[in-house]
Interface confidence: medium
């Protein structure tokens, strides 16, 4: 009797930013819930949290230094991650907990999403490129 989560198997962050959508087999309307995104096979790093309460505005925060935002759909939460580094390429797992009304619900562990961060070219193109080869 757990919530099922669907995630994209892989996303590429070309501009050091990515939208990761977590789709749930559960309608979050008029529920108090905590949706979170976790980094690593062991889910050791909590990247971002979206806290939803039907009587208040959505709260989005990261305690681990990630630049994140979140959007809520009836059966989904989308995490928008910015300023990602190449070395943050990893597998990311969506987690959902419905705290109220009881009973407490959480999800079966999903398959996760591999986010491949392709860094921007930090070296500017030369103003005067050398002669092109024939």
């Amino acid at each position: 009797n757990k919530i099922l989560v669907k995630q994209s198997p892989m996303l590429v962050a070309y501009d050091n930013a990515v939208n990761l959508s977590c789709k749930y087999s559960y309608n979050l309307f008029s529920r108090e819930f905590r949706a979170s995104l976790h980094k690593g096979l062991d889910s050791a790093v909590e990247v971002c949290v979206v806290y939803g309460n039907y009587s208040q505005q959505l709260q989005v925060y990261s305690k681990t230094g990630f630049n994140c935002d979140g959007k809520l759909g009836n059966e989904s939460v989308t995490f928008y991650l910015q300023n990602l580094y190449v070395n943050q390429t990893d597998i990311y797992f969506c987690k959902i907990e419905v705290m109220y009304p009881p009973p407490y619900l959480d999800n079966e562990k999903s398959n996760g999403t591999i986010i491949h961060v392709k860094g921007k070219h930090l070296c500017p193109s030369p103003l005067f490129p050398g002669p092109s080869k024939p």
Epitope: E97, M99, P103, Y104, D106
Partner: nanobody, 119 residues
Framework: EVQLVESGGGLVQPGGSLRLSCAAS????????IGWVRRAPGKEEELVAY????????RYADSVKGRFTISADTSKNTAYLQMNSLRAEDTAVYYC????????????WGQGTTVTVSS
């Protein structure tokens, strides 16, 4: 074996205080939410307070807001209900229940502890 054991009930005068304890064994309270539910004759069962210890989420019934405080000590695997400014209408049997998701609602119940508020 999973068990929830309540204690701390008793007879108290109106305006008095009691602290109920709910000791859990066989599971970790960090993995669930714990609620205090009361049952009184002729009244509907009421979920008075609720806590999710993993991130400190709490919620209270309007009838007890500002008077009751729910807390949890995960190192002791125990939840507490501090009851202040008690009233006659708080008289009931208080149960703690594990609110982990199951098909049938509450997964586990304690045996209950009786609170009587009377002068």
């Amino acid at each position: 074996e999973v068990q929830l054991v309540e204690s701390g009930g008793g007879l108290v005068q109106p305006g008095g205080s009691l602290r109920l304890s709910c000791a859990a064994s066989g599971f970790n309270i960090k993995d669930t939410c714990i609620g205090w539910v009361r049952r009184a004759p002729g009244k509907e069962e009421e979920l008075v307070a609720y806590i999710c210890p993993s991130h400190g989420y709490t919620r209270y019934a309007d009838s007890v807001k500002g008077r009751f405080t729910i807390s949890a000590d995960t190192s002791k695997n125990t939840a507490y209900l501090q009851m202040n400014s008690l009233r006659a209408e708080d008289t009931a049997v208080y149960y703690c229940a594990d609110h982990k998701n199951t098909q049938w609602g509450y997964a586990y119940w304690g045996q209950g502890t009786t609170v009587t508020v009377s002068s």
